[in-house]
């Protein structure tokens, strides 16, 4: 089952993946597409990077991340309803089986219309816009999506999210990304 | 224009190894976007995709296969292989090569084929 | 792995007639889903991809349309050339499947 991601209209979107270079520069081909992994590729192509470079993108769908230490996180630019669904990450990496396939589901909420108070403002400096856990790959990262919009009742949730990733660090072993050679 | 030609012996012994080369012309085998694929077919029955190797180097077999198939590509020669072990007669069939490739715009897969090779298994 | 189901396993009808092909799938393909023509002795043939856009140089007269588990390919008036077998294929999951044939023929 797909991990579930959300944004509100207008904002930008995150969506991660993550893998670590055997070595510095030496990159494996990645991509990003609209609708769950295929056999193939990626259905729908939003952008793909190869060895070297990011060679294809289009309007709107950019890596924000430094994709050559293998950050290659997508974000989706003023986002609309209509880009709700399914996305698929797929780290094409050398060898028998080896590809590593994320379907990870972004919901669109409307925009809310009311003015967010300074005192949420001020919370979004304190804490950062992604909350990660060192858990199963990309699947375990949530975005927190436009911070100023967070109520009271959210920051306690905040904060419990905050303790429970500082206790899957220490409960899981595993990295949070792909980890190749 | 991709053109592919499977090349090989027809009459393989039980319990040997079947060894088929595909021979690309008209593009690199290297070149991005191409995942080469060996289908084959039963006398008088259905496809069955035995494997794949991407132009990345990723490559996936077919579980029922996997414990007896090896897929490699050699640049130099611009040829991929496909290599089955301890064969028998069940693994009678035409071998087809071929390619998808996925068009950086588009995504669309263009499929290439090769013309078959008939792989009988006797003794 | 993914069965794909094909009917009916004959289908026998005159040129100029309109043919409908289906195939299920034992689990959700989305649309990853393409429908191959193979005449005898040849190579078989991609029509359609990704359930309903139609491969380069393949005529009007073949559409496909489907998603998820059941898909279909119709065939609006049939030319002399088109009697052969039809199989579907999805590349949803791997291992790629094939359905067993819909074989259509001149009645």
């Known amino acids: 089952s797909e991990v579930e991601y959300r944004a509100e209209v207008g904002q930008n979107a995150y969506l991660p993946c993550f893998y670590t270079p055997a070595a510095p520069g030496n990159l494996v081909p990645v991509c990003w597409g609209k609708g769950a992994c295929p056999v193939f590729e990626c259905g729908n192509v939003v952008l793909r990077t190869d060895e070297r470079d990011v060679n294809y993108w289009t309007s709107r769908y950019w890596l924000n991340g430094d994709f050559r230490k293998g950050d290659v996180s997508l974000t989706i630019e003023n986002v609309t309803l209509a880009d709700s669904g399914i996305y698929c990450c797929r780290i094409q990496i050398p060898g028998i089986m080896n590809d590593e396939k994320f379907n990870l589901k972004l919901v669109i909420k409307p925009a809310k219309v009311t003015p967010a108070p300074t005192r949420q403002r001020d919370f979004t400096a304190a804490f950062p816009r992604m909350l990660t856990t060192r858990g199963h790959g990309p699947a375990e990262t949530q975005t927190l999506g436009s911070l100023p919009d967070i109520n009271l009742t959210q920051i306690s949730t905040l904060a419990n999210e905050l303790r429970d990733s500082r206790l899957a660090n220490d409960l899981r072993d595993s990295g949070a990304t792909i980890r190749i050679g | 224009q991709v053109t592919l030609k499977e090349s090989g012996p027809g009459l393989v012994k039980p319990s040997q190894t079947l060894s088929l080369t595909c021979t690309v012309s008209?593009?690199?085998?290297?070149?991005?976007?191409?995942?080469w694929s060996w289908i084959r077919q039963h006398p008088g029955k259905g496809l069955e995709w035995i494997g794949y190797?991407?132009?990345?180097?990723?490559?996936y077999y077919n579980p029922s296969l996997k414990s007896r198939l090896t897929i490699s590509v050699d640049t130099s020669k611009n040829q991929f292989s496909l290599k089955l072990s301890s064969v028998t007669a069940a693994d009678t069939a035409v071998y087809y090569c071929?390619?998808?490739?996925?068009?950086?715009?588009?995504?669309?897969?263009?499929?290439?084929w090769g013309q078959g090779t008939l792989v009988t298994v006797s003794s | 792995e993914i069965v794909m189901t094909q009917s009916p396993a004959t289908l026998s009808l005159s040129p100029g007639e309109r043919a409908t092909l289906s195939c299920r799938a034992s689990?959700?393909?989305?649309?990853?889903l393409a429908w191959y023509q193979q005449k005898p002795g040849q190579a078989p043939r991609l029509l359609i991809y990704?359930?309903?856009d139609r491969a380069t140089g393949i005529p009007a007269r073949f559409s496909g349309s489907g998603s998820g588990t059941d898909f279909t390919l119709t065939i609006s008036s049939l030319e002399p050339e088109d009697f052969a077998v039809y199989y579907c294929q999805q590349r949803s999951n791997w291992p790629i499947t094939f359905g067993q044939g819909t074989r259509l023929e001149i009645k």
């Open positions: 008209g593009g690199s085998i290297s070149s991005g976007g191409h995942y």
């Open positions: 190797i991407s132009y990345s180097g990723s490559t």
């Open positions: 689990q959700s393909v989305s649309s990853y």
């Open positions: 071929a390619t998808a490739y996925y068009d950086i715009l588009t995504g669309y897969p263009f499929d290439y």
């Open positions: 990704d359930a309903s």
